[in-house]
């Protein structure tokens, strides 16, 4: 099985003299699971929320962002263990007194039905069936994501 880098280089060889439009990430890397236009990676250890956030960035990814209820359900369908909780990229902003995604946007109150309090040092976890507010210091697993996003790629002929 070719890696996405190998696949990319084959494409480049085949279209040397063209300007092409091609996804930055053609396929999910090995060990990642594809869910629509995202690649997900589930941790096999536990961490507080901030360590989880940092660990995802070592994989050139971010903690999971969930757009809507539909995406939540599809993500939960990938969780095989009933009682396991996973951090996602949503925590409580004390200054704005609201749930804030790590990309800076705020939670649309209709998107997730959160069990627990919205208060300082609270972060959001998901399980197979629910969404919970937990102390950010709680040590649980986490989910990283990479987006499959198209980028313009200019390929120049050999000089």
């Amino acid at each position: 099985q070719k890696s996405s880098i190998e696949k990319c280089s084959v494409d480049i060889q085949q279209s040397r003299n063209k300007t092409t439009e091609r996804p930055g990430l053609l396929n999910c890397p090995i060990y990642w699971q594809q869910l629509r236009e995202k690649c997900l990676l589930f941790s096999h250890t536990v961490n507080p929320w901030n360590n989880s956030l940092a660990d995802c960035s070592t994989k050139e990814s971010s903690l999971l962002l969930i757009r809507d209820k539909d995406e939540l359900i599809h993500t939960q369908n990938l969780i095989r263990d009933k009682a396991i909780l996973f951090w996602i990229g949503l925590n409580f902003s004390l200054s704005e007194k609201n749930w804030k995604w790590i990309n800076g946007s705020f939670l649309n109150s209709n998107d997730l039905e959160i069990r627990g309090d919205a208060k300082e040092n609270s972060c959001i976890s998901i399980s197979q069936t629910s969404v919970y507010s937990e102390y950010c210091s709680t040590e649980i697993r986490w989910i990283c994501q990479k987006e499959l996003t198209p980028v313009r790629n200019k390929v120049y002929p050999d000089s």
Epitope: I30, H44, T45, V46, N51, R80, D81, I84, E139, I140
Partner: antibody
Framework: QVQLVQSGAEVKKPGASVKVSCKAS????????MNWVRQAPGQGLEWMGL????????YYNQKFKDRVTMTRDTSISTAYMELSRLRSDDTAVYYC?????????????WGQGTTVTVSS | DIQLTQSPSFLSASVGDRVTITCKAS??????VVWYQQKPGKAPKLLID???IRHTGVPSRFSGSGSGTEFTLTISSLQPEDFATYYC?????????FGGGTKLEIK
């Protein structure tokens, strides 16, 4: 080179507790999660749980949840596994094993094993 | 819990033989399967991860394949040092489980 060196054999009476240590060297101790796996005489392998040495976070196999405690001392790069209320069927070789990757469940390095015998 | 059933439990073979060990899972585990080798009185040694990826330093005569519920470990040409017990393990769920082992003996 990576090495996990465990404490010596123990003989315990039923109802007692045992604490096994696992000293890591040759890598950054806080960079890899430590697991504990046991093997009863002539039997297969049974996963007991894990500890993240960086944060101290633990996750235990439900079977052992009420009896096992995993701790670590980062200053001496050592992980510990304590099993309480010992029974005769806890007689086994106990191994510490390093999780090879935060995102996959394989064990790339193992300790030499500690034999725990539970007998009255 | 996901059960892993290894077959055969015992296998007699000669140096130079090609041997195959099977591991069957009670549920789909994707490719989250590991193979270990264990010699008497020693700790297990990692051979293969993700069903088919050889660990650093593992000889090329060891290969793994399979996905879903059926997995195989093949040793293409047995060497004297390969006589040992082999275990499969799954990590598709967070309750990691192991197969019962296959003891490979000299014929």
């Amino acid at each position: 080179q990576v090495q996990l060196v465990q404490s010596g054999a123990e003989v315990k009476k039923p109802g007692a507790s045992v604490k096994v240590s696992c000293k890591a060297s040759g890598y950054t101790f806080t960079g890899y999660t430590m697991n504990w796996v046991r093997q009863a005489p002539g039997q297969g392998l049974e996963w007991m749980g894990l500890i993240n040495p960086s944060s101290g976070g633990t996750y235990y196999n439900q079977k052992f949840k009420d009896r096992v405690t995993m701790t670590r001392d980062t200053s001496i790069s050592t992980a510990y596994m304590e099993l309480s209320r010992l029974r005769s069927d806890d007689t086994a070789v106990y191994y510490c094993a390093r999780l090879g990757d935060n995102y996959r469940g394989y064990f790339d390095y193992w300790g030499q094993g500690t034999t725990v015998t539970v007998s009255s | 819990d996901i059960q892993l059933t290894q077959s055969p439990s015992f296998l007699s073979a000669s140096v130079g033989d090609r041997v195959t060990i099977t591991c069957k899972a009670s549920q789909d585990v994707g490719t989250a399967v590991v193979w270990y080798q264990q010699k008497p009185g020693k700790a297990p040694k990692l051979l293969i991860d993700w069903a088919s990826i050889r660990h650093t330093g593992v000889p090329s005569r060891f290969s793994g394949s399979g996905s879903g519920t059926e997995f195989t470990l093949t040793i293409s040409s047995l060497q004297p040092e390969d006589f040992a017990t082999y275990y499969c393990q799954q990590y598709s769920t967070y309750l990691y489980t192991f197969g019962g082992g296959t003891k490979l003996e000299i014929k």
